[in-house]
Interface confidence: low
């Protein structure tokens, strides 16, 4: 049976086997087409999600679809039901928390009172002044907190206590990529991890340990990638994996926060990378122990210079490394998080591509997660 399962897939109606390589090849090889059902699926960017959270204290903003203008949500008459609606619009199913925060002197958006219509937040028509003088600070999920804070050094062995959202994504029990837990059902990783194997069946996620071999494997229900853009073939290197059963959070299994929509990180901002990837370019082997390293944001202009990536780094990507080189992600780290710490840890990038590993002029290139928040929210909403 093990051999059969490894090399063959069982079609129903009538029962017969087909070679496993015929899974997810775009052709209906089973009469009912079940060989094409459990495959990596693409999902369009979708419409603009009409709510968002700002890095200014996680304050809620609402889109007026008629004008295309964004407004800050006033705390007046804001309720738990409105908080739940806002989070559902972003695809969250967990119980949100919210509080009032004072309108700051730098408030640049108009502040309006919020109401609900057809399970979407709307601006109240006759909205007067914001009497409370407060904005809504909203958290849809408790995220980005770890038991241990890493020390700021070059490269060192990591503990799962520091990075409880890190997972190993494995195909046929072999580590292929890293990934990050976003909520009980969802793991964030890179689309290119699934280029070779597009059948969901053999992919597993392992969470809760910093050692590659030692964690229980979790079944995957869906793998969703964003649609390919032929104009920018390296863009859209992002994927979401939906787990078959929700994770139970613990000290070693916790979610990382998504970035805020306006999370613009300036050059030299300190960031962290983690992974079980190759410890040497073109050789070495996967690290059995999770490794961590501190890096920094590298200016996109520098990254696109003639001696570096020559314009290949688009606005939906970001570069990170250290100016002198030597600290970088490598093969096997793909899909893992590039992380920024403010009050919580945020996954600002996904390990995507680069020339070599650790070269001074060719740092790691990462998918910029803030560029894909709309897509993530639309996928989650479709799967609620």
């Amino acid at each position: 049976k093990v051999i059969l399962d490894k090399y063959y897939f069982l079609c129903g109606q009538p029962l017969h086997f087909i070679p496993r390589k015929q899974l997810c090849d775009g052709e209906l090889d089973c009469p009912l087409g079940e060989d094409e059902e459990h495959c990596v699926k693409s999902f369009p960017e979708g419409p603009a999600v009409a709510v968002r959270l700002s890095k200014d204290r996680s304050t809620l903003q609402v889109l007026d679809s008629a004008t295309g203008n964004w407004f800050s949500a006033c705390f007046d008459n804001f309720t738990e039901a409105l908080a739940e609606t806002a989070c559902r619009q972003m695809g969250y199913s967990s119980k949100p928390t919210f509080r009032a925060v004072e309108i700051g002197p730098d408030q640049d958006l108009d502040v309006v009172e919020i109401t609900e219509n057809s399970q979407e937040l709307r601006m109240r028509n006759s909205s007067g002044p914001c009497l409370s003088g407060s904005l809504v600070s909203l958290h849809c999920l408790a995220c980005g907190k770890s038991l241990k804070t890493p020390r700021v050094v070059g490269v060192e062995e990591a503990s799962v206590d520091s990075w409880p959202w890190q997972v190993s994504i494995q195909y046929d029990k072999q580590h292929v990529c890293g990934g990050s837990i976003l909520d009980p059902h969802w793991v964030l990783t890179a689309a290119h991890c699934f280029r070779k194997h597009t059948d969901v069946f053999n992919w597993k996620v392992r969470a809760g340990s910093d050692k590659l071999g030692s964690f229980p494997s979790l079944a995957v229900a869906k793998i969703i990638i964003i649609e390919f853009n032929p104009m920018y073939p390296k863009d859209n290197d992002i994927a979401l994996m939906k787990l078959q059963f929700p994770l139970t959070f613990s000290g070693t299994v916790r979610p990382i926060c998504l970035p805020f929509f306006d999370e613009e990180l300036t050059p030299a901002t300190p960031l962290w990378i983690i992974g079980w990837g190759f410890t040497k370019q073109n050789g070495g082997k996967m690290s059995d122990i999770l490794l961590q390293a501190s890096v920094q944001v590298i200016d996109s202009t520098r990254c696109n210079a003639d001696d570096a990536y020559q314009g290949e780094v688009t606005e939906k990507m970001m570069c990170a490394g250290i100016p002198e080189g030597g600290v970088d992600t490598c093969q096997g780290d793909s899909g893992g998080p590039l992380m920024y710490q403010s009050d919580q840890w945020h996954v600002v990038g996904i390990v995507s591509w680069g020339y070599g590993c650790g070269g001074p002029s060719t740092p790691g290139v990462y998918t910029k997660v803030s560029a894909y928040l709309n897509w993530i929210y639309n996928v989650w909403k479709a799967e609620l």
Partner: antibody, heavy 121, light 107 residues
Framework: QVQLVQSGAEVKKPGASVKVSCKAS????????MHWVRQAPGQGLEWMGI????????TYGHNFQGRVTMTRDTSTSTVYMELSSLRSEDTAVYYC??????????????WGQGTLVTVSS | EIVMTQSPATLSVSPGERATLSCRAS??????LAWYQQKPGQAPRLLIY???TRATGIPARFSGSGSGTEFTLTISSLQSEDFAVYYC?????????FGQGTKLEIK
Amino acid sequence: QVQLVQSGAEVKKPGASVKVSCKASGYTFTSYYMHWVRQAPGQGLEWMGIINPSGAGTTYGHNFQGRVTMTRDTSTSTVYMELSSLRSEDTAVYYCARGPRDTAMVRFDYWGQGTLVTVSS
Amino acid sequence: EIVMTQSPATLSVSPGERATLSCRASQSVSSYLAWYQQKPGQAPRLLIYGASTRATGIPARFSGSGSGTEFTLTISSLQSEDFAVYYCQQYGSSPGTFGQGTKLEIK
């Protein structure tokens, strides 16, 4: 097996519009791009544009921009090509052709049987 | 856009003989070249893609070669069903463009 079945021949007057359909079967409809290619009588092949059935994104050839609209209906696995402001030089056989999803400008591995559109006053 | 030029316009060859069709691109298209066969009243059929890879179900007598700007389709031993019009198409640059065709006829 993969099949692309197109609607029947059409005769149109100059200035009118025509809408040709192409029904796909035998594969996952949203996993492949669909292109439209036309061939005037006794002439070569001319690429008109592409639609992504998964997200309905389109790219049209320069010669057809402003006159062509490509749409799809995922419930029936059908793509449509509408050409407006018809002129006599639009008389041609119009083909839908399937192309893999990993790159937009690509070989066409399966073709519809073609739909003859005649534009005549 | 890239202009594809096929030669000759018509090629007369006897059954059993070898036929060589040429296609030239106005600028490099790397190996992004396909060949199609079209018979009267039928849709084109993919023969070769990637300049040299035979499509599924295409007999081994069809072979493609070349890269950059010069490409060749060779039919090693012509069968009666091979007499048709052959088109080359580049897909290395948008929009994909076709050659004007080579008519392969019985000598």
